[in-house]
Interface confidence: medium
Amino acid sequence: IVLRPPRVHNSEENTMRALTLKDILNGTFSYKTFFPNWISGQEYLHQSADNNIVLYNIETGQSYTILSNRTMKSVNASNYGLSPDRQFVYLESDYSKLWRYSYTATYYIYDLSNGEFVRGNELPRPIQYLCWSPVGSKLAYVYQNNIYLKQRPGDPPFQITFNGRENKIFNGIPDWVYEEEMLATKYALWWSPNGKFLAYAEFNDTDIPVIAYSYYGDEQYPRTINIPYPKAGAKNPFVRIFIIDTTYPAYVGPQEVPVPAMIASSDYYFSWLTWVTDERVCLQWLKRVQNVSVLSICDFREDWQTWDCPKTQEHIEESRTGWAGGFFVSTPVFSYDAISYYKIFSDKDGYKHIHYIKDTVENAIQITSGKWEAINIFRVTQDSLFYSSNEFEDYPGRRNIYRISIGSYPPSKKCVTCHLRKERCQYYTASFSDYAKYYALVCYGPGIPISTLHDGRTDQEIKILEENKELENALKNIQLPKEEIKKLEVDEITLWYKMILPPQFDRSKKYPLLIQVYGGPCSQSVRSVFAVNWISYLASKEGMVIALVDGRGTAFQGDKLLYAVYRKLGVYEVEDQITAVRKFIEMGFIDEKRIAIWGWSYGGYVSSLALASGTGLFKCGIAVAPVSSWEYYASVYTERFMGLPTKDDNLEHYKNSTVMARAEYFRNVDYLLIHGTADDNVHFQNSAQIAKALVNAQVDFQAMWYSDQNHGLSGLSTNHLYTHMTHFLKQCFSLSD
């Protein structure tokens, strides 16, 4: 299947130009998406190009500015949040990034009713997290690891927690490992639907070992960054969940929610919290050995002012072939009766599907089925359930949006997106207004992305929100590479791959091949999405063929493929990349003397192991910020897939799967090792140990570090990185500069 057909005929080719590295580094061909900031069933906010905050009413067709760029600019605001009663807007400035999701900022509250900033009882700075209640204009915020509550923006704050301490106790915000590997958010507090209660997590990191690294900065002495970071097998954070009545916060104070007994008996995690009603909450817990998850539904007892979590409302999810869930354990979507819910988990055939749980998990009703996977439940209304899946035409790398009519019997299923813009759009996500009255579809490709607005009842398209016309025009004279997505059938395993081919690709010629790999558990690289990036340039300008392959351990093709890597990371992912390369060589257009592999993070680990596989297939390769030993990486992530690094568990494979153990095998390849010294995620330690092992084995290699850069290698480092890698590959492939 050719996803991006050549745009032009040969007669026009002389007016066309290839992509340049500069195009990529400048983001010349980046695209825009439009996600409405829904504030009701038919209204949304959007920040206009000139930075006014505009309210759109779909039904009246009217729009007006609720906050001007002038006011935004007066406090250098880069973000905003409207209170649900529409009386106030918080303006966020002085953004200072911390980890992947977390940042601190200064907040100003603008009073729309008075047309002025709220004066008196101003918020402290910098704030770690701030949010409005779901109804009205109460404020909850986290400052110096403690939670505060304001009944109104101008009121004095009520302090909810007092034990917060940097790097020790975190209230309402996650510590490093919960942020990165469990919650995937900057916050750990949750308002009940009408703002009566506020739930929050407290993380105790007192006994967690600390990773310390130098941050060089500009001073005479570097400073040391200290982060409580549990590596595999280390002491983990201890978590507790509390709920406070925000109407009378001082009355009983925060009440702790009990942990299910079967979870509390050993080390455990809290994985998510979902409010059902103001007086019913659902918590999800996970054993440290992450194959058992418990969903617990708790109710408020007015007479005792406590939260009760009866055993009859505990639902256990267990995996016998791998870990619980996909990347994370899925979260429930409750129906209107406030007790039954919809949830995605593995069916008896080992495919992730939507189930309806009324009383027990054993009696769950399967809503979707087939040799494909349901990926996300977007919204459940009284008569419809909207979800995404990769069912259509059996392409795992696609995403279409479906509607199941749950009000009718039998429930009827309709693909909302499959035939909308079939060539252009095969990978969608959606954003729904209240009660799914309207929704936005955001199509990511394979053609140029487009965002559209739809009627939630009829699915009729109302208008185009963003179609990237400027991008389309800019690409008219660019020779883009061709892309195709196909599959290889090898030993009962299906290996989907994406191949990016030079614009004038000729099967009778030989091309250098670059494998781009990620390959981490529950990831997917072969997706029908639009991208003009570094590898597009390598194909367009430098005439390389680039391939991405989804091997064992990758997602959305069933548990057999996903859980194949359980307790054995670093084996099958590498084997499958090598198998694919051999198949590509058999296709006849690959120069087998010029094959390279590169990857970042988990991909850096896989590319390193592939280079050190001793197959002789790869001439060279690059590892950016690689993991080199699973003992160096975070407990929550690593143990999910590898178990514990103890003798009676999986220590042997922890030791066997390191890059360092294969140092000798790098002797006959050109290896470029790259890492940021301030990487809080995959610590520089990983590359330091690879380098040490290579030096000890007297193996020559190339390396580049990026001072004070984290796992993302952003800013000017990005330009330097891609320029450096380009030179390395061109040298490897004997391509002239």
Partner: antibody, heavy 121, light 107 residues
């Protein structure tokens, strides 16, 4: 029903004082800024004074600065305009109005019926 | 202060006519422009806010447009109850200022 009712108008001599009141009902009074607007006989509308929801912030038109003081009692849902050193040119119908919330450029969405102030010797 | 200038000062029209009133600001006021209707002896009534948004309860024959400095109020089909004086008002900056008014009379 949302409404504003002004009172306190009447005849006053130049240099004299008058206090206008505006009773609000049907909405959360303390959440909204309020204004006074006047209209001289046969003329257009002229903004006079405004006050924030909390009452902590007021501002006046240059023509009345130092002479008129606007205040509010949120516990009584009442708005006031204290007018001192009155002049003949202050003769007008005085309206109180509510400033709409929900967006920054708030319009005046609810108006009272007006009260006539006549300054004459 | 921002000056608001309305034109015409007055106009005569018949029932069913399409009527257009313009309002010009002395500097850009974005879309922070409101229109009011006032009948003799009555308080003003909000018709249009934020240049083009119809206030709830106002008939759809009234519409507003414009941004920056030039704005228009249109009555698509004049009804007997529409004979009144119309005022524009900017809420971009303090003090809020009104136009001098446009009187719509029966022809």
């Amino acid at each position: 029903e949302v409404q504003l009712v002004e009172s306190g108008g009447g005849l006053v001599q130049p240099g004299g004082s008058l206090r206008l009141s505006c009773a609000a009902s049907g909405f959360t009074f303390s959440s909204y800024a309020m204004i006074w607007v006047r209209q001289a006989p046969g003329k257009g509308l002229e903004w006079v004074s405004a006050i924030s929801g909390s009452g902590g912030y007021t501002f006046n038109a240059d023509s009345v600065k130092g002479r008129f003081t606007m205040s509010r009692d949120n516990s009584k849902n009442t708005l006031y305009l204290q007018m001192n050193s009155l002049r003949a040119e202050d003769t007008a119908v005085y309206y109180c109005a509510k400033r709409d919330g929900g967006y920054e450029g708030g319009a005046f969405d609810i108006w009272g019926q007006g009260t006539l102030v006549t300054v004459s010797s | 202060d921002i000056q608001m200038t309305q034109s015409p000062s007055s106009l005569s029209a018949s029932v069913g006519d399409r009527v257009t009133i313009t309002c010009r600001a002395s500097q850009s006021i974005s879309s922070y422009l409101n229109w009011y209707q006032q009948k003799p002896g009555k308080a003003p009534k909000l018709l249009i806010y934020a240049a083009s948004s119809l206030q709830s309860g106002v008939p759809s024959r009234f519409s507003g447009s414009g941004s920056g400095t030039d704005f228009t109020l249109t009555i698509s089909s004049l009804q007997p109850e529409d004979f009144a004086t119309y005022y524009c008002q900017q809420s971009y900056s303090t003090p809020p200022t009104f136009g001098q008014g446009t009187k719509v009379e029966i022809k």
